[in-house]
Interface confidence: medium
Amino acid sequence: KLLQVSTIAMQQQEKLIQQERALLNFTEWKRSCALQMKYCQAFMQNSLSSAHNSSPCPNNWIQNRESCYYVSEIWSIWHTSQENCLKEGSTLLQIESKEEMDFITGSLRKIKGSYDYWVGLSQDGHSGRWLWQDGSSPSPGLLPAERSQSANQVCGYVKSNSLLSSNCSTWKYFICEKYALRSSV
């Protein structure tokens, strides 16, 4: 009888563990969906506002190829920076290539000098992997040079010619990016 009760208890425990795993997966999925939704809204907002504007980029944004960039005027923590970009139909900068990195660092030198600028890169708390905001991994040449010693969440930033990492709660300037409007000519 005791063995039977013990077996049932173990089965229930196993079931509970499975449910917890499912809940965790669902929570992750929900978070991912919320982020995707934000991206869609940002993209739609960008498309609509651009339709009323003949120039490829809004005032005070810098254009390079198909992208428009905005360099912030005040400091923010990483999460607030991302919110600010999303509000403007853009996202924190996602660096796709060395060419883009060179353009950004060259432009920053001209505009502001050697400060810290948040980009859309953060470290996954569980796996320690670096991820851009769209969930993709940076190319090997674009991984932050130094691993932050912070016990808190770690995010990526650009300084001079380097991609570095820091506690996401520190204050930095930030860079937003959105698609440039294609000329209809």
Epitope: P58, N59, N60, E73, I74, T80, K87
Partner: nanobody, 117 residues
Framework: QVQLVESGGESVQAGGSLRLSCAAS????????MAWSRQAPGKEREFVAR????????DYADSVKGRFTISRDNAKNTVYLQMNSLKPEDTAIYNC??????????SGQGTQVTVSS
């Protein structure tokens, strides 16, 4: 076009208090982050405090934490910086700034704070 006008800066003794105000005109600033920064002669600009549009989130530089308080009155389109336990190293020109996309850097002319020992 947004105009920002700072006021309230003056000379005080170390340990004293001041309240700086930043009045905005030309546009409602209630949706925008606001910040106070300062620059002492020969030094780089330093951001000392930031407040979110709704006023629910504030951040402070380590050098002023526990002494300075940023607040805003969106009905009056004004942001404040309450500065207590002032130190000589707080001497600087204080500017208020706002983050408005698609616009130049909106920053006032500044107000001078001098703290003597």
């Amino acid at each position: 076009q947004v105009q920002l006008v700072e006021s309230g800066g003056e000379s005080v003794q170390a340990g004293g208090s001041l309240r700086l105000s930043c009045a905005a005109s030309g546009r409602t600033i209630s949706n925008y982050d606001m910040a106070w920064s300062r620059q002492a002669p020969g030094k780089e600009r330093e951001f000392v405090a930031r407040i979110s549009g709704s006023g629910d989130r504030t951040d402070y530089a380590d050098s002023v934490k526990g002494r300075f308080t940023i607040s805003r009155d969106n009905a009056k389109n004004t942001v404040y910086l309450q500065m207590n336990s002032l130190k000589p190293e707080d001497t600087a020109i204080y500017n208020c700034q706002t983050q408005i996309f698609g616009s130049p850097n909106f920053s006032g002319q500044g107000t001078q704070v001098t703290v003597s020992s």
